[in-house]
């Protein structure tokens, strides 16, 4: 079998949902010593970066300015050390937003409910679209999809305090081209009287994986790596 290097990690810096005409930044984290990184888009080569010096950095950033529907889709990356290529990274879906119109999000029976109540979100957009998406702030990877001509329902079932938080919806023109976001709707779920005060609201931190953790190798790291390699050889 043909030898390959471990697959790199691909991430979107800040978010995978990029407003049209804004810049997307994708990070490809491979390994120290990689002389070339390639970004692939829908299976075709999109961009190349050669880090300098290659032994001092474990990944690169690919910048995609002027985001539009032609650049929205599935991205992956690979890297090369010497003549040896890595496996392909997982696929990353890059979405362009702020296309066309703005939907309206509402919630029934209302934004303030008691734990155990059934809640349904409604997303409405009058321009032609059939797919709607509901996202909770701080959980942008957990996208709920629903279908309808001008309106879609998102039944939540009996809610708990874990459902608390801000929600937005989008109309989708295809999997990678979304409308402007709706205005947020904040769902407040009160629990049993004794533990209402204890139930924390859901954090609205940005998604932890939407950051680029590229590092430059210091002399100390290099010495430790060399020492570790020598120790491994001695143990053998």
């Amino acid at each position: 079998p043909k030898q390959t290097l471990p697959k790199p990690i691909i991430r979107a810096e800040s978010t995978y949902m990029v407003p049209k005409e804004k810049q997307a930044t994708l990070c490809c984290q491979g390994s120290y010593g990689a002389v070339e990184y390639q970004l692939h888009f829908e299976g075709s080569l999109f961009a190349v970066e050669r880090p300098k010096p290659p032994e001092r950095i474990n990944g690169v950033k690919f910048h995609i300015p002027d985001m539009n529907s032609r650049k929205a889709g599935r991205y992956s990356c690979i890297y090369r050390v010497g003549e040896l290529w890595s496996e392909r990274s997982d696929l990353l879906d890059l979405v362009v937003t702020e296309m066309y119109d703005t939907p309206t999000l509402s919630v029934h029976p209302g934004p303030e409910v008691t734990s155990g109540e059934k809640v349904t979100f409604y997303c409405r957009l009058d321009t032609a679209t059939s797919m709607f998406l509901l996202l909770k702030e701080g959980r942008s990877r957990d996208v709920q999809r629903s279908y309808g001509k001008v309106q879609a329902e998102f039944p939540m079932g009996p809610v708990t305090t874990a459902h608390r938080g801000s929600y937005r919806c989008f109309g989708s023109y295809n999997n990678y081209a979304w409308s402007f976001p709706s205005e947020p709707v904040k769902l407040l779920v009160t629990g049993d009287i004794e533990n209402t005060s204890l139930a924390p609201t859901d954090p609205t931190f940005p998604d932890s994986w939407d950051t680029c953790l590229l590092t430059r190798e210091t002399g100390l790291q290099k010495d430790l790596a060399l020492w570790d390699h020598t120790a491994q050889n001695l143990l053998r």
Epitope: V48, E49, H63, K71
Partner: nanobody
Framework: EVQLVESGGGEVQPGGSLRLSCAAS????????MGWFRQAPGKEREFVAA???????YYAESVKGRFTISRDNAKNTVYLQMSSLRAEDTAVYYC????????????????????WGQGTLVTVKP
């Protein structure tokens, strides 16, 4: 707004050479990544060569060793030196730019480019 104007096209015999130029207007040239694409009659536009802000280059396999891309930031111009030309190099050659860009990315996919020239025709025939 960036405007790109290609020149240097013409008719040449197989084995001959040509140098294409692409003059860019605007102050953003130094922060632009540049590329050359070509389109032969009845075919799709294809990547030829590209250059990053800091002069890193990348070539299509079909032109590697024969074509050289370079840039002169003082003149806001990118060049494509073509040698050992073949009949299959006959096409309209387009200059393109990615503006703005950061880092040292070299762009290969046509979708990456947001500014395009009108093209210059290169014909290779005996």
């Amino acid at each position: 707004e960036v405007q790109l104007v290609e020149s240097g096209g013409g008719e040449v015999q197989p084995g001959g050479s040509l140098r294409l130029s692409c003059a860019a207007s605007g102050r953003t040239f130094a922060s632009a990544a540049m590329g050359w694409f070509r389109q032969a009659p009845g075919k799709e536009r294809e990547f030829v060569a590209a250059i990053s802000r800091s002069d890193d280059t990348y070539y299509a396999e079909s032109v590697k060793g024969r074509f050289t891309i370079s840039r002169d930031n003082a003149k806001n111009t990118v060049y494509l030196q073509m040698s050992s030309l073949r009949a299959e190099d006959t096409a309209v050659y387009y200059c393109a730019a990615v503006v703005p860009t950061y880092g040292n990315n070299i762009y290969v996919h046509s979708a990456a480019y947001n500014y395009w020239g009108q093209g210059t025709l290169v014909t290779v025939k005996p």
